[in-house]
């Protein structure tokens, strides 16, 4: 079950919940946002203070890492299995250092299997964080420091740091290096969403959250 099911079962408070996949006993802890936009959101990524190192291996991105109450990555395998069970939307919430917030909402989101390198699939962009998708379309395979699946003759994950759906290397990386305030501009390997803040601006906070489209 995901956070949408947790919400429907009567748990309407934000917090960390134990989720399981259908037909599985495997459990994963995730943060559920039960307030934003009607609630039921499963948080799959969060950056907020630089407390967690996001320059991780393929295996770590597969199973997840970090602290669900703080900075974390839920895990590509869980997200892939979840988003292939039914149709999900993806909302990406962004904060800059000047107190501004923006979002990108994709009306259909899923990840391919590990055999297909957890390729991202997105459709139907709306929101305030740019008219053009900062995740390159069509979607790319996931790359990490030890799995170079990008379209660059360079190694995007090593250059820009963090695991992401790099193109060559493309206009976003929400898993880049965390730079504190007043050190966050002209950083070429920071937390980037190009079509909102442009080049070299490293964001203060990001949240990636998913919910069934029919919620």
């Amino acid at each position: 079950r995901d956070c949408a099911e947790v919400f429907k079962s009567g748990h309407t408070t934000n917090g960390v919940y134990t989720l399981t996949l259908p037909n599985s006993t495997e459990e994963v802890k995730a943060y559920c946002d039960m307030e934003a936009g009607g609630g039921g959101w499963t948080i799959i990524q969060r950056r907020e203070d630089g407390s967690v190192d996001f320059q991780r291996t393929w295996k770590e991105y597969k199973v997840g890492f970090g602290n669900p109450s703080g900075e974390y990555w839920l895990g590509n395998e869980f997200v892939s299995q979840l988003t292939n069970q039914q149709r999900y939307v993806l909302k990406i919430h962004l904060k800059d250092w000047e107190g501004n917030e923006a979002y990108s909402l994709y009306e259909h989101f899923y990840l391919s299997s590990e055999e297909l390198n957890y390729r991202i699939h997105l459709k139907g962009l709306t929101g305030t964080a740019g008219k053009i998708s900062s995740i390159s379309q069509p979607g790319n395979d996931f790359s990490t420091k030890d799995a170079d699946n990008d379209k660059c003759i360079c190694k995007c994950s090593q250059m820009l740091t963090g695991g992401w759906w790099f193109d060559a290397c493309g206009p976003s990386n929400l898993n880049g290096m965390y730079y504190p305030q007043r050190q966050n501009t002209n950083k070429f390997n920071g937390i980037k969403w190009y079509y909102w803040k442009g080049s070299g601006y490293s964001l203060k906070g990001t949240t990636m959250m998913i919910r069934p489209a029919d919620f």
């Epitope: 660059c152 090593q158 250059m159 193109d167 070429f188 390997n189 980037k192 442009g198 080049s199």
Partner: antibody, heavy 121, light 107 residues
Framework: QVQLVQSGVEVKKPGASVKVSCKTS????????FSWVRQAPGQGLEWLGW????????NYAQKFQGRVTMTTDTSTSTAYMELRTLRSDDTAVYYC??????????????WGQGTLVTVAS | DIQMTQSPSSVSASVGDRVIITCRAS??????LAWYQQKPGTAPKLLIH???SLQTGVPSRFSGSGSGTEFALTINSLQPEDFGTYYC?????????FGGGTRVEIK
Amino acid sequence: QVQLVQSGVEVKKPGASVKVSCKTSGYTFSNNGFSWVRQAPGQGLEWLGWISGYNGNTNYAQKFQGRVTMTTDTSTSTAYMELRTLRSDDTAVYYCARDQDYSNFHWLDPWGQGTLVTVAS
Amino acid sequence: DIQMTQSPSSVSASVGDRVIITCRASQGLSSWLAWYQQKPGTAPKLLIHSASSLQTGVPSRFSGSGSGTEFALTINSLQPEDFGTYYCQQANSFPLTFGGGTRVEIK
């Protein structure tokens, strides 16, 4: 293919200003940035600054701060560099060069053909 | 600002020779380094980026290596058309900075 075509030779007097244009074609203007680099006769390459084709953000070398202004016109896919209060040691070939701004890659390819600016009284 | 120091400042070599040009950065660049070739009267041309990635269309006799503060451009089997001046450039942070250049002459 991607092309950057710069404006022609300029001869200026000390104290004057010069504005060099760089018209681009063959790619999405807003995905890229532009660096301006100059080369004095017989010398090496000197970076003046950079501008984003997406949102017009700029970053100027300290040496030229207050004397240089870089702008873009997205409707014509053209970048401009204006240098004010010219001195004789500003005599150089001025190049515009494209980078992959949206990937945060600031290696320069391709380059314009260069614009010779001569400052003499 | 990051200082880039190139050596040698000039080199004279014969066709078929191997030429190595080095570039040292005043602080670590990871792999954020590019190499350019410039022939007299023309604009520089990008040869290598990301320290070792060959730009499309550049002959495979050119190769780049290094990371951090020490980098090298190697020309294997120098050809007559390889004369010119070679520059390294750091792309780690603004301001972008270039090495002083290495002039390659054919003996």
